[in-house]
Interface confidence: low
C-alpha cells in the first residue's frame, strides 16, 4: 500500500465483447442470514478523502480509547500510533489499558516511501459504528515512523484488511478481520463504499463530511445501483484479481493481457491512484492524451506532479475518456467490465493561489509492482470483499461523482477466452533448495 500517498508472453485471444449472453452471477442468489439487507448502524461510518485515505472510528483497550483508523485493503496489520507525533491528535496509550498484553516482539514495516515500526501486543478492539462485538486482536503499537502519518488526515492508525500471508513480521500474526470472524458470528465478508467529494475539501469540511461506508459482515443494498458482478480472488494475500482487457473510450489497448497483471493486480483502498505497470501506463496515457487532445497539458500533469485548473464549474469533463477494466468473471470464459469517468481519475485538489478555480491532479500513475486499483477506482463502485467465497464484487456506487452525460458502469457478461493466461505467476523461491 502506498499513501499520496504501492512490483515469455502470449498474444491475447481476447477480451472482445462478442455480444454472446451468458448466465451472470450477481447478488440474485439465495440469501444468507446476516449477509444481506440493511446495516443502518454502519452506513456513513467512514470519513476522509481519496488523497489522504478513508478512516473508521475504532476503540482499543480498557477503558476504551477512541482512534480514527485508516481502512486499508492493501495490507494486513492493525497498527496504531502509540507515541506522540506532531501529526497525531491522539494516540494509543498502552499503559492506560488494563487489557493490553505485550507480545515482546518488534515489527518494522517499510513502504516505498516511508516506514513505521512498533511493538506487538494484543488488546480488546471494537468498532462503534460496526458490529456490536469486541475482539482481542493483534495491535502493532507504532513507536517510530517516517512519512507514514499524514498531516491533517485525522487518522491515527491503519486497519490492514488483507490476508495473513502479507502480515508483518510474518504470516503467523493473525490479521484483525480473521480475529473478528473467529471470535464472533460476523460473516467473513465486508464491503466498502468510498465516496469521492468531487471537489477539494478543507480541514473543517473533511471533519464534517461523510466519506462512505464500511459494512462489516454484509452487503447494504442502499449503497449501490444495478447488479453486483463478482471476480475471483486469485490468491489470498493481497486482494488479487485478474484484469483481462483495458479500454480507453471503448478502444482496446490491445496489449497482452499478462501485461495488465504484471506482476499482480490488487484492490487497495489504502492507495490513492489507479496505478498501472509501466508499459500499460504508457499505453494508457498515450491513449488518454489522444482522446483529450483538444486541450494540451504539460508533461508534469500526466506524471501526477502538476495541477491543471479551470475556472470554477467549467471543467471540460467531456474531453476526457472513460476507462474500462474488464475483470475475470466467475463463470468460465465470462468477464465483466467496470468503467470509470474522469470524475474519478482526475483528483480534485486545493490550489491556494487560485482558490476560485477547480484544480485537479491526474490520479493514474506508474507502478513497478503491478496494477493497483486504488481509491480513484473504488470511488466509482460499491466493492464487496467476499472472503468466504473468495471473490470481489463490484456495483455502481450510489455516491459516485458523475455528470448528466456519463455515469460509472458495471456491465456484463462478455465472452473472454483463456483468461487464466492473463495472470502472472510470480517466481517463487524454492526454499527447500536453500536448505541443502
Amino acid at each position: 500500500t502506498q499513501h499520496g500517498i504501492r512490483l515469455p508472453l502470449r498474444s491475447g485471444l481476447g477480451g472482445a465483447p462478442l455480444g454472446l449472453r451468458l448466465p451472470r452471477e450477481t447478488d440474485e442468489e439465495p440469501e444468507e442470514p446476516g449477509r444481506r439487507g440493511s446495516f443502518v448502524e454502519m452506513v456513513d461510518n467512514l470519513r476522509g478523502k481519496s488523497g489522504q485515505g478513508y478512516y473508521v472510528e475504532m476503540t482499543v483497550g480498557s477503558p476504551p480509547q477512541t482512534l480514527n483508523i485508516l481502512v486499508d485493503t492493501g495490507s494486513s496489520n492493525f497498527a496504531v500510533g502509540a507515541a506522540p507525533h506532531p501529526f497525531l491528535h491522539r494516540y494509543y496509550q498502552r499503559q492506560l489499558s488494563s487489557t493490553y498484553r505485550d507480545l515482546r516482539k518488534g515489527v518494522y514495516v517499510p513502504y516505498t516511501q516511508g516506514k513505521w515500526e512498533g511493538e506487538l501486543g494484543t488488546d480488546l478492539v471494537s468498532i462503534p459504528h460496526g458490529p456490536n462485538v469486541t475482539v482481542r486482536a493483534n495491535i502493532a503499537a507504532i513507536t517510530e515512523s517516517d512519512k507514514f502519518f499524514i498531516n491533517g488526515s485525522n487518522w491515527e492508525g491503519i486497519l490492514g484488511l488483507a490476508y495473513a500471508e502479507i502480515a508483518r513480521p510474518d504470516d503467523s500474526l493473525e490479521p484483525f478481520f480473521d480475529s473478528l470472524v473467529k471470535q464472533t458470528h460476523v460473516p467473513n465478508l465486508f464491503s466498502l463504499q468510498l465516496c469521492g467529494a468531487g471537489f477539494p475539501l478543507n480541514q473543517s469540511e473533511v471533519l464534517a463530511s461523510v466519506g462512505g461506508s464500511m459494512i462489516i459482515g454484509g452487503i447494504d443494498h442502499s449503497l449501490y445501483t444495478g447488479s453486483l458482478w463478482y471476480t475471483p480472488i486469485r490468491r489470498e494475500w493481497y486482494y488479487e484479481v485478474i484484469i483481462v482487457r483495458v479500454e480507453i473510450n471503448g478502444q482496446d489497448l490491445k496489449m497482452d493481457c499478462k501485461e495488465y497483471n504484471y506482476d499482480k493486480s490488487i484492490v487497495d483502498s489504502g492507495t490513492t491512484n489507479l496505478r498501472l505497470p509501466k508499459k500499460v501506463f504508457e499505453a494508457a496515457v498515450k491513449s488518454i492524451k489522444a482522446a483529450s487532445s483538444t486541450e494540451k497539458f504539460p508533461d508534469g500533469f500526466w506524471l501526477g506532479e502538476q495541477l491543471v485548473c479551470w475556472q470554477a464549474g467549467t471543467t471540460p469533463w467531456n474531453i476526457f475518456p472513460v476507462i474500462s477494466l474488464y475483470l475475470m468473471g466467475e463463470v468460465t470464459n465470462q468477464s465483466f467490465r467496470i468503467t470509470i469517468l474522469p470524475q474519478q481519475y482526475l483528483r480534485p485538489v486545493e490550489d491556494v493561489a487560485t482558490s476560485q478555480d477547480d484544480c485537479y491532479k491526474f490520479a493514474i500513475s506508474q507502478s513497478s509492482t503491478g496494477t493497483v486499483m486504488g481509491a480513484v477506482i473504488m470511488e466509482g463502485f460499491y466493492v464487496v470483499f467476499d472472503r468466504a467465497r473468495k471473490r470481489i464484487g463490484f456495483a455502481v456506487s450510489a455516491c459516485h461523482v458523475h455528470d448528466e452525460f456519463r455515469t460509472a458502469a458495471v456491465e456484463g457478461p462478455f465472452v473472454t477466452l483463456d483468461m487464466e493466461d492473463c495472470g502472472y505467476n510470480i517466481p517463487q523461491t524454492d526454499e527447500s533448495t536453500l536448505m541443502t
Epitope: H85, Y108, E144, K147
Partner: antibody, heavy 119, light 107 residues
C-alpha cells in the same frame, strides 16, 4: 548522552580513497538514521545521504553517487563513509549526524572530520 | 532539487532584540523544515524540526513558523551566545537540501 565521535583529520592525495568513521554512543544505533553532510567555505551545507544501520538501507544524493559509499557495523555501533577518486573539490569538513526514524532532521551531530586533498 | 533561499547572508542585532531569519523553498515542502545553529568552529546543532517544534533543550526564545514555501526562525530576547550562523533544511523530499545560511552578528 547521545554522542557521535568522528575520526580525525585526513590529508589525502588526489585519486586516493578515504574512509571516515562515526562511532555512536548513548542510544540504540540500529533505531536511527545516520546522515552525512559536507561543508565547504562558501558552499554551505550539502546533504550527501543517509544509512539506516538497522536494515542497512541507504539513500544517496545523486550528486554523490559513485563518490560516497555508506556502511555500518552494528557490532561496534560505527557508521562509515568511503570517498573515492578524491579531488581538491572533496576538501571539506564532513559531518555525521543522527536522524530519528520518524522525523528525518539531524538531531545530534558529530564534531566533524576535516579532509584535505592536496598533491 | 528543492532550493532553499535565505535572503539575508548577514543580520545584525542587539542583545535583547527580536530578530527573524527567513527561508524560502522553491516548492512546497509542507512542514518538513528544520533549523540549525552553527557557532564558529563548532558543528551544527538542531534548534527546530517540523517547522515549529523545538528540539530538546532549546531555549523557548527560539521559535519556528511557516509551512509550504515560507519559513521563519524568530529569536526573541537575543543573547550574546546566539552569535552564530543559522541554516534551514528541508526533508520533504530527496535529496535533502540546506539554505545558504544567515550569519547573526551582535552589535
Amino acid at each position: 548522552e547521545v554522542q557521535l565521535q568522528q575520526s580525525g583529520a585526513d590529508l589525502m592525495k588526489p585519486g586516493a580513497s578515504v574512509k571516515l568513521s562515526c562511532k555512536a554512543t548513548g542510544y540504540t544505533f540500529t533505531g536511527y538514521w545516520i546522515e552525512w553532510v559536507k561543508q565547504r567555505p562558501g558552499h554551505g551545507l550539502e546533504w550527501i545521504g543517509e544509512i539506516f544501520p538497522g536494515s542497512v538501507s541507504t539513500n544517496y544524493n545523486e550528486k554523490f553517487k559513485g563518490k560516497a559509499t555508506f556502511t555500518a557495523d552494528t557490532s561496534s555501533n560505527t557508521a562509515y563513509m568511503q570517498l573515492s577518486s578524491l579531488t581538491t573539490e572533496d576538501s571539506a569538513i564532513y559531518y555525521c549526524a543522527r536522524s530519528p526514524i520518524y522525523y528525518d532532521y539531524a538531531d545530534y551531530w558529530g564534531q566533524g572530520t576535516t579532509l584535505t586533498v592536496s598533491s | 532539487d528543492i532550493v532553499l533561499s535565505q535572503s539575508h547572508k548577514f543580520m545584525s542585532t542587539s542583545v535583547g532584540d527580536r530578530v527573524s531569519i527567513t527561508c524560502k523553498a522553491s516548492q512546497d515542502v509542507g512542514t518538513a523544515v528544520a533549523w540549525y545553529q552553527q557557532k564558529p568552529g563548532q558543528s551544527p546543532k538542531a534548534l527546530i524540526y517540523l517547522a515549529s517544534n523545538r528540539h530538546t533543550g532549546v531555549p523557548d526564545r527560539f521559535t519556528g513558523s511557516g509551512s509550504g514555501t515560507d519559513f521563519t526562525l524568530t529569536i526573541s530576547n537575543v543573547q550574546s551566545e546566539d552569535l552564530a550562523e543559522y541554516f534551514c533544511q528541508q526533508y520533504n523530499s530527496y535529496p535533502y537540501t540546506f539554505g545558504g545560511g544567515t550569519r547573526l552578528e551582535i552589535k
